[in-house]
Amino acid sequence: IVLRPSRVHNSEENTMRALTLKDILNGTFSYKTFFPNWISGQEYLHQSADNNIVLYNIETGQSYTILSNRTMKSVNASNYGLSPDRQFVYLESDYSKLWRYSYTATYYIYDLSNGEFVRGNELPRPIQYLCWSPVGSKLAYVYQNNIYLKQRPGDPPFQITFNGRENKIFNGIPDWVYEEEMLATKYALWWSPNGKFLAYAEFNDTDIPVIAYSYYGDEQYPRTINIPYPKAGAKNPVVRIFIIDTTYPAYVGPQEVPVPAMIASSDYYFSWLTWVTDERVCLQWLKRVQNVSVLSICDFREDWQTWDCPKTQEHIEESRTGWAGGFFVSTPVFSYDAISYYKIFSDKDGYKHIHYIKDTVENAIQITSGKWEAINIFRVTQDSLFYSSNEFEEYPGRRNIYRISIGSYPPSKKCVTCHLRKERCQYYTASFSDYAKYYALVCYGPGIPISTLHDGRTDQEIKILEENKELENALKNIQLPKEEIKKLEVDEITLWYKMILPPQFDRSKKYPLLIQVYGGPCSQSVRSVFAVNWISYLASKEGMVIALVDGRGTAFQGDKLLYAVYRKLGVYEVEDQITAVRKFIEMGFIDEKRIAIWGWSYGGYVSSLALASGTGLFKCGIAVAPVSSWEYYASVYTERFMGLPTKDDNLEHYKNSTVMARAEYFRNVDYLLIHGTADDNVHFQNSAQIAKALVNAQVDFQAMWYSDQNHGLSGLSTNHLYTHMTHFLKQCFSLSD
């Protein structure tokens, strides 16, 4: 299936050029998306090209600037947030990145009624997190690991927590492992729907072992970065959830929400919090052995001023074939009765589908079904449920948006996006206004991305929000590679792959092959999305064929494929890449002597193991920031898939699945090992141990480190990295510079 239109007129060929590495590094062909910042059923805010904050009313068609670029510039604001009562805007500046989601910033409050910044009782700096209440203009913020509340922006703050301590106690913000592996947010506090209550998590990291690494900087002595980071089997953070009444917070104080008894009996995690009403909250908990999850619905008892979580409102989700959920345990979407909810979990056939839970999970009503998966529930209204799935035409790497009418019986299903721009758009996400009155569709490809606005009742397209015209024009004289998404059937396993082919691809010729792999549990690489990136350049300019393969352990194709890797990471993911390579060779256009593999993070682990598989298939390969032993990686992630590194659990496979154990097998391949020294996620330790094992085995290899760079290798390091990898591959494939 050719997803990119091929050129028709040969006369065009002369004026067209291949992609260059510079194009990629400069982001010349990057695209834009448009996500409305919804503030009501029919209004949204958007930051214009000249940095004004503009309010759009869909129904009147009017728009006006609520905050000028002059005001933004006066405090060097890079972000903003309008209070729900529309009286104030917070302006965010001095952004300073911490980990994947977290950052600190300076905040200024601007009063829209008088056009002045709020003076007196200004916010401290830097703030770790700040947000408005959902109604009115109360502010909650986290400063130095403690939570503060302002009843009004000009008021003095009320301190809610007092025990916050750097690297020890975190209130309202997650510690490293919860941020990266559980919540995937920079915050751990949640307002109730009308702002009456504020729930927050407290993470106690006192007993967690600390990872320490040098940050070289510019000083005479490097400084040491210390992060409480639980590796597999280590002591974990202790989490507690509290709720405080924000009307009179100084009276009762924070009230702890009880943990379900079956969860509290051993090590556990808190996984998410969902407010249902102002006086009903839903908490999700997970055993440390992550195959049992409990959803607990708690009610406020006015007379006791406590939160009551009756056993009758505990819903257990258990997996017998793997871990609970997909990457994370799914979160519930409550219906209007404030007790029943919709949730995605595995059906009896092992496919993730939407279920409706009214009383017990056992009595759940299955809403979607089939040999495909429901991926996200966007919105539930009185009469409709909007969700995304990969059902359409049986392509797991697509995403379409569906509407199920839940107001009528039997419920009817309609694909909202399947036939809108069928060739251009096969991978969508959506953003809904209040009550789903309107929604934006963001199409990511396979054609050039486009964002559109739609009527929530009729699904009619109202207008194009962003169509990337400039990008379209810029690409007109570029020889883009061709892309195809197909599948291989091998031993009852379906291996979907994406192949990126040189523009003048000729099946009768032989091409060098580069496998790009990630392969982590519940990931998906073969997606129908648009991208002009490094591998596009390698195909366009350097004439390589690039392939991405989704093997066992990957997502959205059922539990059989997903949970195949349970407790044995590093086996089937590698086998399936090798199997695919053999099949590609059989296709006849791959030069068997010029096959390489590369990957980053989990992909670096898989590429390393593939290179050390002893198959003789790969001439060379690259591992960027690889995991080398699961004992070195974070507890929450690792144990989800591998269990514990103890004798009576899974220590044996922890030991067997290291890259170091296969050091001897690197002798006959060219290996490039790359890592940032300040990687907070996959620690440099991983590559240091690979290097040590290779040296001890007297195996030659190439390596590059990036001083003071984290897992993302950003900034100038990115340019250096891709230039370096390009040289390595061209040398490996005997391509002239």
């Epitope: 003095p156 100084a250 009276y251 009230q255």
Partner: antibody, heavy 116, light 108 residues
Framework: EVQLLESGGGLVQPGGSLRLSCAAS????????MSWVRRSPGKGLEWVSA???????YYADSVKGRFTISRDNSKNTLYLQMNSLRAEDTAVYYC??????????WGQGTLVTVSS | EIVLTQSPGTLSLSPGERATLSCRAS???????LAWYQQKPGQAPRLLIY???SRATGIPDRFSGSGSGTDFTLTISRLEPEDFAVYYC?????????FGQGTKVEIK
């Protein structure tokens, strides 16, 4: 009806110790943060300490390290263990329902006199 | 810590008269965290007003509170014989919670 009844006050020498108790009834004791407030002739009303239903404690700087607040939810009782007592700790000690404000119910108070 | 200064120290009035008691904070206090108490000799303090202006349960409507920022007022619209007592303002906006030194309302 909410009732708070303090006991344990008395005369003690400087450097000595005393343990105050407050028996609570008429409300779900375990749910509420409770405080000790004192009234001394020289200082007026002064907040001393608080303890949440779950046992988290808070102290005024003037008593930190010397006084320990605790509670027994099964007995509906609040305690204040006072060590290294000083003359300036002389006051009527009230137990009150509430964290920082408001204190909506107060006991009758118990007198602590620190004198040699 | 926040210092609360009450004025006047003593207020001499007759029953039926209006009493206006002032409480000034050394720094801004959010009205949500300002309370007033009444104390009679030999008795425990009694909560009158919380949140600067909300009457506690069972408090007659002749008692009212107002103010914001650093200036707060307790007003007793018509003094009754049982209203003669010491009145304290209190803030809980910042730890430690602090009380004013009190205003004594006495019979003239």
């Amino acid at each position: 009806e909410v009732q708070l009844l303090e006991s344990g006050g008395g005369l003690v020498q400087p450097g000595g110790s005393l343990r105050l108790s407050c028996a609570a009834s008429g409300f779900t004791f375990s749910s509420y943060t409770m405080s000790w407030v004192r009234r001394s002739p020289g200082k007026g009303l002064e907040w001393v300490s608080a303890i949440s239903g779950g046992g988290r404690t808070y102290y005024a700087d003037s008593v930190k390290g010397r006084f320990t607040i605790s509670r027994d939810n099964s007995k509906n009782t609040l305690y204040l263990q006072m060590n290294s007592l000083r003359a300036e700790d002389t006051a009527v000690y009230y137990c009150a329902k509430g964290w920082f404000t408001p204190f909506d119910y107060w006991g009758q108070g118990t007198l602590v006199t620190v004198s040699s | 810590e926040i210092v609360l200064t009450q004025s006047p120290g003593t207020l001499s009035l007759s029953p039926g008269e209006r009493a206006t008691l002032s409480c000034r904070a050394s720094q801004s206090v959010s009205s949500s965290y300002l309370a007033w108490y009444q104390q009679k000799p030999g008795q425990a303090p009694r909560l009158l007003i919380y949140g600067a202006s909300s009457r506690a349960t069972g408090i007659p409507d002749r008692f009212s509170g107002s103010g914001s920022g650093t200036d707060f007022t307790l007003t007793i619209s018509r003094l009754e014989p049982e209203d003669f007592a010491v009145y304290y303002c209190q803030q809980g906006n910042q730890i430690p919670p602090t009380f004013g030194q009190g205003t004594k309302v006495e019979i003239k």
